[in-house]
């Protein structure tokens, strides 16, 4: 058993049929010695008396808020949550496996630049009685600070018969060094509590590996005289690290016909313009990637040929 | 060329060669991004590689103030990786494919380090850890880790030379 926060405790349970329960001794936080009684949750029934209460925690029915009282006055509370371990593996019932980029990916994180700011998100089908708490650091043995905000519900979508809820959190490294080569990964730890179930999820990454620039901005076409060619130009996204002479991007320009089956013409360039042939009913799209490190491409910025 | 006394390197040449290094490092092991090598436990190899750190002056302001600190750090790293790529980690079993970019990568590391330090001038170089993994699978894992680390190192080096070429060239 360990303390998650004040008056909230997590009981770690081996979850197999013939596992014995965990013996837990609750102590009433009071100088009083006599006349103390214990109750659970909303029930007024007395579960035991005395300054300590020894319980066996085996089921979710044994978890909950234990309260000690004296003469009708509440003295203290202890909320017990359960963390299940099945076949040596901690349960992951609360969050959905996103399966990208690999199985058992519960947290996904992205950064728009090298400033040390990043966003993580996760999915669940649970809509109520759900709380998240996020902590992060650079490295684990001698951790350096990363400050995370509160996790918020960022999207809801319907998947078949189920509703899926997306939560996200923004974090910022306290003393970020955008130009340095990272040697210690960022660690992100999410505590998830659903009713009386506790789970924790972690992700470890370098900012450089989760970079995904915003799409290029101000995408414009300039027809070239007496030609089917056009000059496409664009700018670095506002959110990209500066100076651009140091934090450079490379770009992919694509000409795509109306039909998905039509051959796509692609040009790669380090410049912020390119000359392409603009077919009727086609569209021109441009996306960006770090020039020197192959992290994710941005989403496409698009403009119609006409 | 970077003279330890303080004259500027051939920024444009260094830019071109460092960008080529980036391309080669990724073609040497493109899928490495999909493997979480940190899960395999960080052995001393990747712990001992020289990283370009915050105080090394490789940020735009540091380069403007005095690029020598940063260039020396980059040089150290290039020599370190050049020696690693020439070691039995890469020359031993399992043999690299004949068309593997590792050979070109090795030569380009040497080329860039020579651009930074001509004959007769010596910056101190970092000691290479003595690594002789016994099993072929260990060697393979070590290669992945070294290439992964090299990708990050040459990315910073390439940024430095690109910025230098754009803003510090005479």
């Amino acid at each position: 058993i360990w303390e998650l926060k004040k008056d909230v405790y997590v009981v770690e349970l081996d979850w197999y049929p013939d596992a014995p329960g965990e013996m837990v001794v609750l102590t009433c936080d009071t100088p009083e010695e006599d006349g103390i009684t214990w109750t659970l949750d909303q029930s007024s029934e007395v579960l035991g008396s005395g300054k300590t209460l020894t319980i066996q925690v085996k089921e979710f029915g044994d978890a909950g808020q234990y309260t000690c009282h004296k003469g009708g006055e509440v003295l203290s509370h202890s909320l017990l949550l359960l963390h299940k371990k099945e076949d040596g593996i901690w349960s992951t019932d609360i969050l959905k496996d996103q399966k990208e980029p690999k199985n058992k990916t519960f947290l996904r994180c992205e950064a728009k630049n090298y400033s040390g700011r990043f966003t993580c998100w996760w999915l669940t089908t649970i809509s109520t009685d759900l709380t998240f708490s996020v902590k992060s650091s650079r490295g684990s043995s001698d951790p350096q600070g990363v400050t995370c905000g509160a996790a918020t519900l960022s999207a809801e979508r319907v998947r078949g018969d189920n509703k899926e809820y997306e939560y996200s959190v923004e974090c910022q490294e306290d003393s970020a060094c955008p130009a340095a080569e990272e040697s210690l990964p960022i660690e992100v730890m999410v505590d998830a509590v659903h009713k009386l179930k506790y789970e924790n999820y972690t992700s470890s990454f370098f900012i450089r590996d989760i970079i995904k620039p915003d799409p290029p901005k101000n995408l414009q076409l300039k027809p070239l005289k007496n030609s089917r060619q056009v000059e496409v130009s664009w700018e670095y996204p506002d959110t990209w690290s500066t100076p651009h002479s140091y934090f450079s991007l490379t770009f992919c320009v694509q000409v795509q016909g109306k039909s998905k089956r039509e051959k796509k013409d692609r040009v790669f360039t380090d410049k912020t313009s390119a000359t392409v042939i603009c077919r009727k009913n086609a569209s021109i799209s441009v996306r960006a990637q770090d020039r020197y490190y192959s992290s994710s491409w941005s989403e496409w910025a698009s403009v119609p040929c006409s | 060329r970077a003279v330890p006394g303080g004259s500027s390197p051939a920024w444009t040449q260094c830019q071109q060669l460092s960008q080529k290094l980036c391309t080669l490092a990724w073609s040497a092991h493109p899928l490495v991004g999909h493997m979480d090598l940190r899960e395999e436990g960080d052995e001393e190899t990747t712990n001992d590689v020289p990283h370009i750190q915050c105080g090394d002056g490789c940020d735009p302001q540091g380069l403007r103030d005095n690029s020598q600190f940063c260039l020396q750090r980059i040089h150290q790293g290039l020599i370190f990786y050049e020696k690693l790529l020439g070691s039995d980690i890469f020359t031993g079993e399992p043999s690299l494919l004949p068309d593997s970019p590792v050979g070109q990568l090795h030569a380009s590391l040497l080329g860039l380090s020579q651009l930074l330090q001509p004959e007769g001038h010596h910056w101190e170089t970092q000691q290479i850890p003595s690594l002789s993994p016994s099993q072929p699978w260990q060697r393979l894992l070590l290669r992945f880790k070294i290439l992964r680390s090299l990708q990050a190192f040459v990315a910073v080096a390439a940024r430095v030379f690109a910025h230098g070429a754009a803003t510090l060239s005479p």
Epitope: D18, G21, G48, Q56, G61 | -
Partner: antibody, heavy 119, light 107 residues
Framework: EVQLVQSGAEVKKPGESLKISCQSS????????IGWVRQMPGQGLEWIGI????????RYNPMFRGQVTMSVDKSSSTAYLQWSSLKASDTAMYYC????????????WGQGTMVTVSS | EIVLTQSPATLSASPGERATISCRAS??????LAWYQQKPGQAPRSLIY???NLQSGIPARFSGSGSGTDFTLTISSLEPEDFAVYYC?????????FGQGTRLEIK
């Protein structure tokens, strides 16, 4: 006052189905799991299983798994034990009981339902 | 599963006497053992939990002791209403199991 009131005695033929009930009152129904115990004529007590009234989480005695089904209706604070096809060997007194949280024993019992299966 | 063996199977005693019933487990159940009393035609009634804790409303003449594998229920001075069948039950490991029962009869 805590009360567990069980449905009346049943006489059934082999192969028939049956659902007996146990209605709780006088306490917070969702705080306490409900269990079932069998007592065959002239015999001792046998633990069938327990069930959460919150999410219908169930722990069956392997000996009874597949033989009986436990269920619960939160809205009426009622627990059920059912059989899809009775056998003569199911003849017994069935007790529902309230599981004490933080312990696991049964602190309050229903009066019992006698089930007789005979052709 | 854990087997609980009660002894004796039948105990004959007179009102006012001390009665002791033993319950032995086939493996340790820590202190997670309860005692119940059942009278003819009635449901069992909880007497003792956690090996030695008296259930609310049960007379103080009933007491329990033991831990691990050996447990005892003691009735210090028998009253006429105490003649019944007594069961021990372990609730440490599923499936929870009962002893076969001890019949306490009037001598």
């Amino acid at each position: 006052e805590v009360q567990l009131v069980q449905s009346g005695a049943e006489v059934k033929k082999p192969g028939e189905s049956l659902k007996i009930s146990c209605q709780s009152s006088g306490y917070s129904f969702t705080t306490y799991w409900i269990g079932w115990v069998r007592q065959m004529p002239g015999q001792g007590l046998e633990w069938i299983g327990i069930m959460s009234p919150v999410d219908s989480d169930i722990r069956y005695n392997p000996m009874f798994r597949g033989q009986v089904t436990m269920s619960v209706d939160k809205s009426s604070s009622t627990a059920y034990l059912q059989w899809s096809s009775l056998k003569a060997s199911d003849t017994a007194m069935y007790y529902c009981a309230r599981r004490r949280p933080g312990q696991g024993y049964f602190d309050f019992w229903g009066q019992g339902t006698m089930v007789t299966v005979s052709s | 599963e854990i087997v609980l063996t009660q002894s004796p199977a039948t105990l004959s005693a007179s009102p006012g006497e001390r009665a002791t019933i033993s319950c032995r487990a086939s493996q340790s159940v820590s202190s997670w053992l309860a005692w119940y009393q059942q009278k003819p035609g009635q449901a069992p009634r909880s007497l003792i939990y956690s090996a030695s804790n008296l259930q609310s409303g049960i007379p103080a003449r009933f007491s329990g002791s033991g831990s691990g594998t050996d447990f005892t229920l003691t009735i210090s001075s028998l009253e006429p209403e105490d003649f019944a069948v007594y069961y021990c039950q372990q609730y440490n490991i599923y499936p929870y199991t009962f002893g076969q029962g001890t019949r306490l009869e009037i001598k």
